[in-house]
């Protein structure tokens, strides 16, 4: 999916209002310095591309993120403010259904969510730079 035509301001508002709080809740008990950020993004479409992939693509070390509240809200936000996004996400929905139901938060998942927070913060910063 090409995120170029999304309403970035609306996505930013949704992130600040709800998604960020859910991410921080998920990370509760860990310090921001506990994990190294190893990925970043360059502009708004790039940030959303990587956020989408990291949130919804299961990895061997952390297969369960797509079921989390922040992931559900991320999906809803992208569907709302990115034209045609929801039509491209049938496969992602299947991946979510296959995701583990276990609510155990592993260290690797915490690390992945730490990376997500970094990508979202970069998204906000690139938005501020463009204004």
């Amino acid at each position: 999916y090409d995120f170029t035509n999304c309403d970035f301001q609306k996505i930013e508002a949704d992130y600040l209002r709800t998604i960020s709080k859910d991410l921080i809740t998920y990370m509760s008990g860990t310090k921001s310095t506990d994990f190294n950020n190893t990925v970043s993004c360059s502009n708004r479409p790039h940030c959303l591309t990587e956020i989408q992939s990291l949130t919804f693509n299961p990895t061997p070390r952390c297969a369960s993120l797509a079921k989390e509240m922040f992931a559900r809200k991320t999906k809803a936000t992208l569907a709302l403010w990115c034209p045609g996004y929801s039509e491209t996400q049938i496969n992602a929905t299947q991946a979510m259904k296959k995701a583990r139901k276990s609510k155990v938060t592993t260290n690797k998942c915490l690390e992945q969510v730490s990376q997500l927070l970094g990508l979202w913060r970069r998204f906000i910063r690139t938005l501020l730079k463009k204004q």
């Epitope: 190893t38 990925v39 970043s40 360059s42 502009n43 790039h46 992939s53 990895t59």
Partner: antibody, heavy 117, light 108 residues
Amino acid sequence: QVQLQESGPGLVKPSETLSLTCAVSGYSISSGYGWSWIRQPPGKGLEWIGYISYYGSTSYNPSLKSRVTISRDTSKNQFSLKLSSVTAADTAVYYCARTNLLYFDSWGQGTLVTVSS
Amino acid sequence: EIVMTQSPATLSLSPGERATLSCRASQSVSSYLAWYQQKPGQAPRLLIYDTSSRATGIPARFSGSGSGTDFTLTISSLEPEDFAVYYCQQYSNWPQYSFGQGTKVEIK
């Protein structure tokens, strides 16, 4: 410390597919970062080809996108480049590199690939 | 596509002298600029990222400055091992990251 090593055929015929592999040691490619390919034609500058992230997303240079595939094998801790329909213009030293999806902080030594019949 | 233009193509200097290399972008890249050093037969090495941050292990004699479209890499006092080709790279315009054509710093 992470080390990267490119391997693959040094000679490819025009119209065929160039295939290279980058073996990574000292760091798990599924733990973090992105893993990238960059090339440098003889005596010329650098050109970014694309990357695959540790979580599997890929991004390619638009000028090469229709011909490029980057994939990974986490069990072998390596990632690969396939470039189809090559011409003499694809003759270059091909580097693999670690990236934070923006810039490139560790590089392999490079491998020269010549496209010729 | 953002075109990166480096000048001069070649810089002839003596050890101990100050080197000033220029990189100009065809449109603003904010502070999203990196510098690399490449010696003959070797891979490039990251020197500077985000315009002015030194990469791990890079000596303090290397510094970067600029913003928008005009950037500078300065080597305060050239050491014998600094004679090489230097490339700038913009990463503002994903997915079209681009490099300059290089500046060769040679011994005078």
